[in-house]
């Protein structure tokens, strides 16, 4: 907590951001909270991006003020209007582009003071993998597929029974460029699979880590997958 006096003679207010990642082509959120004011008229929110001349977004006197907005963000930004009064200055960014990556500043003015915090925003592509038994193969084979990744990730297989085993010799991974020529489809095949075992296909780049699990028994197949964004830290 920083308590001081700015040029205006008002106190500093606490502003908190969380580093996050955007999935290109989808909507993203740049997270920012601040000490709330009791009235909306004095709240000003400005989002700025390092290296960009115009504003990313401005909200003042209870409404969006977009006359100074940079062209690259035109029609793509919005604050959560009903949440501003309770200290939420987070920005929704529509149709995330690769070029949206960078350092953003969330700058806040209220009747109680001013404050700002920076946010590192990474962009890329990440998706949930699905692991299936490949019945077309000659031996027991698992196929792990994830439709959209960027930058190119690493793929590692693991098994519950053979913990610590290296499956690189018995797996084959390929990356197929998608139609928009940025993201890639990830396909990894694991050979010589034994039943009554749980296998995990782990896909990771510097933005996200995703895991697809499959449990193969004689009577059933169980699947589970989850995705985790990396480097989400508050400042």
């Amino acid at each position: 907590l920083i308590i001081g006096f700015g040029i205006s003679g008002r106190h500093s207010i606490t502003v908190t951001t969380v580093a996050s990642a955007g999935n290109i082509g989808e909507d993203g959120i740049l997270s920012c909270t601040f000490e709330p004011d009791i009235k909306l008229s004095d709240i000003v929110i400005q989002w700025l991006k390092e290296g960009v001349l115009g504003l990313v977004h401005e909200f003042k006197e209870g409404k969006d003020e977009l006359s100074e907005q940079d062209e690259m963000f035109r029609g793509r930004t919005a604050v959560f209007a009903d949440q501003v009064i309770v200290g939420n200055a987070s920005l929704r960014l529509k149709n995330v582009q690769l070029t949206d990556a960078g350092t953003y500043k969330c700058y806040i003015i209220t009747s109680k003071g001013k404050g700002n915090a920076n946010l590192e925003y990474k962009t890329g592509a990440f998706s949930m993998p699905e692991v299936n038994v490949d019945y077309n193969a000659s031996s027991e084979t698992l196929r792990c597929e994830a439709p959209r990744w960027f930058p190119q990730p690493t793929v590692v297989w693991a098994s519950q029974v053979d913990q610590g085993a290296n499956f690189s010799e018995v797996s084959n991974t390929s990356f197929e460029l998608n139609s928009e020529n940025v993201t890639m489809k990830v396909v990894s095949v694991l050979y010589n699979v034994t039943i009554n075992n749980t296998y995990s296909c782990m896909i990771e780049n510097d933005i996200a880590k995703a895991t697809g699990d499959i449990k193969v028994t004689e009577s059933e197949i169980k699947r589970r997958s989850h995705l985790q964004l990396l480097n989400s830290k508050a400042s």
């Epitope: 009791i38 209870g62 409404k63 309770v86």
Partner: antibody, heavy 115, light 107 residues
Amino acid sequence: QVQLQQPGSVLVRPGTSVKLSCKASGYTFTSSWMNWVKQRPGQGLEWIGGIYPNRGTTEYNEKFKGKATLTVDTSSSTAFMDLNRLTSEDSAVYYCARDSRFADWGQGTLVTVSA
Amino acid sequence: DIMLTQSHKFMSTSVGDRVSITCKASQDVSAAVAWYQQKPGQSPKLLISSASYRYTGVPDRFTGSGSGTDFTFTISSVQAEDLAVYYCQQHYNTPLTFGAGTKLELK
């Protein structure tokens, strides 16, 4: 879930003071404004003022300056309102309400000023 | 101070009716208007914030609209449990102010 607990009623003598309490639970007490609202029997709602517990910052309705004093005890997540020099005009239900949207309300304390 | 005028002190309605309550601000308050419902002997309950945002758990028959100085609160199909007093409130500037209330009653 959010709860704001207020005593049901209090009877006070004219010319005296009263301290009303509002005990909060179910959210981070220090990070939301706490507002106080007056409602006379059969009447509408009047905002008295608000306090931001994290700093103790207060905002008052000019009409209630000198009449009401807002304080908090962050250790017990409790907001207080002192009303002084009470008259029959102060007989009303007093509500505490959380955040600038008045998202959650206490049940209210009925203050009766009577000799 | 910003004054909020609710033109009808009482409104008569029937179950299943669509009803709209208006609120006029004495100056521009952007979209900083909330609507509350108060039933007899109970504390007010937030229904709509920032003019049009339904609060968590509020049924979708309740809607709000407007910006600037003119605001409307609508119940698309009145239920018996909706009979109450409805208040508008502005949080654009201090002092925060409420409308005088509109009592919704059965015809």
